[in-house]
């Protein structure tokens, strides 16, 4: 086909000789044809159409990519001739850097729907060169990691040695989708979530007297996990005293947040302190009530069949522990004023007498 009518874009890939990095070309088809072939995600800010016939990427027809040999030979089908270059919908991924990637790349729709579509193509002139050794040593990596739950930032490798003030306007894409919120050389992330993982592309324009080039870099961002540096945090009970009714059943819940640990051995126990005695109570198993990638909330309840006078003199202690350390929360029971009748008190005293006998034969010291 005749490529003279293709729109042209010039791109520069300055790769680091010290690291493995990838490169991506987007098939920036002119409107309105682009909307037939590429997902909205590949559009630049000025190219977003009112309507896209395909909203789900699985419905999208592909584009065909070619490479134009410098000697004027016929166009080469990239899939057949270049195993290190991968075609994926509307993008072309270069797995390995090298000056041999320099050349002209043409994309056009695979399915021609109208005579006008024949001229619907983009020619990308790609220049690939190693980064000069003069460029700064601490340039950002093409593989960047963000720690889940913390703050972080993604830096554009080709601009990471420049201050924000010096930096030109940058266009960012994530997984091919334009990120219109930021135009600086760094994306600041207030709190890292899994969705921040992906392939980021940063573009800026470099002009000389002769022409204008888009300088592009690709960053693979991973969200990573790490062990907490904090002891578990008791969320409930919050108060150190709890109003109760004598003779009535009572459940005290202990809820604690445990930060992520690769080897997770949470400990959650209930103790009772009575004068100089202290013992662990046999209570139902702890259960996880909320689990995320950065922490887990665990609950364990202590159940009293009926609150007795003796219970009012005791301290109920929730103890939680991880590999960093432990936290405790004590709860003292306090009788609700004006609650319960004479029968309740007699009943409670009867339970207390039975309980005294039971504890004398069963309690043990906790060290």
């Amino acid at each position: 086909f005749n490529i003279s009518g293709c729109s042209t874009k010039k791109l520069l890939w300055a790769y680091s000789t010290r690291s493995e990095e990838e490169f991506i070309l987007f098939c920036d088809l002119p409107e309105p044809q682009k909307s037939h072939f590429c997902h909205r995600s590949q559009l630049s800010p000025t190219q977003v159409p009112d309507h896209l016939p395909f909203t789900d990427s699985k419905d999208l027809p592909d584009v065909q990519w070619y490479r134009q040999p410098s000697n004027g030979d016929p166009l080469e089908d990239i899939r057949k001739s270049y195993p290190h270059i991968i075609q994926d919908k509307c993008t072309l991924r270069f797995l390995t850097p090298g000056v041999n990637n320099t050349g002209s790349y043409i994309c056009r729709p695979k399915m021609i729907k109208s005579p006008y579509d024949v001229a619907c193509c983009v020619k990308m002139i790609l220049e690939v060169k190693p980064q000069s050794n003069a460029s700064c040593e601490n340039s950002a990596s093409h593989k960047q990691d963000l720690l889940l739950g913390s703050t972080g930032s993604i830096s554009c490798p080709s601009l990471s040695c420049q201050s924000d003030a010096q930096s030109p306007e940058v266009t960012w894409y994530k997984n091919g989708k334009l990120l219109s919120m930021t135009r600086s050389n760094r994306i600041v992330v207030d709190e890292v979530y899994i969705y921040h993982q992906g392939t980021y592309v940063c573009d800026y324009t470099q002009s000389d007297t002769a022409s204008s080039w888009t300088v592009r870099a690709v960053v693979q961002v991973r969200t990573i996990v790490g062990d907490t540096k904090l002891k578990p945090d008791i969320l409930d009970p919050v108060e150190s005293t709890l109003e109760v009714e004598l003779g009535k059943p009572l459940t005290i819940s202990c809820k604690a947040r445990f930060g992520f640990e690769r080897v997770f051995n949470p400990v959650m126990k209930w103790y009772i302190k009575d004068a100089d005695l202290e013992w662990e109570v046999s209570v139902p198993e702890a259960k996880s009530i909320k689990s995320t990638l950065k922490d887990e909330i665990i609950e364990r309840n202590i159940i009293l069949e009926k609150v007795t006078q003796r219970d009012l003199r005791r301290t109920f202690v929730c103890f939680v522990q991880n590999s960093i350390g432990n936290t405790t929360q004590s709860v003292q029971l306090k009788e609700k004023r004006g609650s319960g009748g004479l029968n309740d008190i007699f009943e409670a005293q009867k339970i207390e007498w039975h309980e005294t006998v039971r504890f004398q034969s069963h309690h043990h010291h906790h060290h």
């Epitope: 889940l148 899994i194 993982q197 991973r222 996990v225 790490g226 640990e261 960093i324």
Partner: antibody, heavy 124, light 107 residues
Framework: QVQLQESGPGLVKPSETLSLTCTVS????????WSWIRQPPGKGLEWIGY???????NYNPSLKSRVTISVDTSKNQFSLKLSSVTAADTAVYYC??????????????????WGQGTTVTVSS | AIQLTQSPSSLSASVGDRVTITCRAS??????LAWYQQKPGKAPKFLIY???SLESGVPSRFSGSGSGTDFTLTISSLQPEDFATYYC?????????FGQGTRLEIK
């Protein structure tokens, strides 16, 4: 760009303590786990243990009684000490960055950056 | 400890061949398996994680599959630089363990 470099004596006497240090350059030691792995001559790989930059550790039970891994974040280094060595501890010792990659509802751990390895011979 | 058994222990193949290496776990490990490539005198290089996810920069001729106890590493068309020893590694439970390795040689 992260690079790891093991250092330490290449020869250790039996019953003594093997001490190695891994220096991390081109990146921070923070936020990552750091592992030690060894490979006896002509054999496969054996994981020794890891340390998180905050200091939490996990060791291979088969070596636990003899192993200590520590970290010095100010120097961007982590170290291995293996006590009471015998000829069976002769191996190439590697340090590696151990990453927990989060994806959907689980994690995948991989050793994505390795040192070039240092040979340690246990002999009198 | 979970044992990983690789087969074959060694194999000879030619450039352009399709090669499959298997790794069997002594108990179910979900998809918590990684593959590494090691060349003589060099440190291992990480290729695949989560049984089938390719590390960025690793050629697409490498692929991994499997879940539970049976896993495979496939090289669709061998290149000269692929001749090396390959190790599988499980992260499902501690201690972390490696397979004994599969040595891939030029025929």
């Amino acid at each position: 760009q992260v690079q790891l470099q093991e250092s330490g004596p290449g020869l250790v006497k039996p019953s003594e303590t093997l001490s190695l240090t891994c220096t991390v350059s081109g990146g921070s030691i923070n936020n990552y786990y750091w592992s030690w792995i060894r490979q006896p001559p002509g054999k496969g790989l054996e994981w020794i243990g890891y340390i998180f930059y905050s200091g939490t550790t996990n060791y291979n039970p088969s070596l636990k009684s003899r192993v200590t891994i520590s970290v010095d974040t100010s120097k961007n280094q982590f170290s291995l000490k293996l006590s009471s060595v015998t000829a069976a501890d002769t191996a190439v010792y590697y340090c590696a960055r151990d990453v927990g990659i989060a994806a959907r509802n689980s994690y995948y751990y991989v050793m994505d950056v390795w040192g070039q390895g240092t040979t340690v011979t246990v002999s009198s | 400890a979970i044992q990983l058994t690789q087969s074959p222990s060694s194999l000879s193949a030619s450039v352009g061949d399709r090669v499959t290496i298997t790794c069997r776990a002594s108990q179910g490990i979900s998809s918590a398996l990684a593959w590494y490539q090691q060349k003589p005198g060099k440190a291992p290089k990480f290729l695949i994680y989560d049984a089938s996810s390719l590390e960025s920069g690793v050629p697409s001729r490498f692929s991994g599959s499997g879940s539970g106890t049976d896993f495979t590493l496939t090289i669709s068309s061998l290149q000269p630089e692929d001749f090396a020893t390959y190790y599988c590694q499980q992260f499902n439970s501690y201690p972390i363990t490696f397979g004994q390795g599969t040595r891939l040689e030029i025929k």
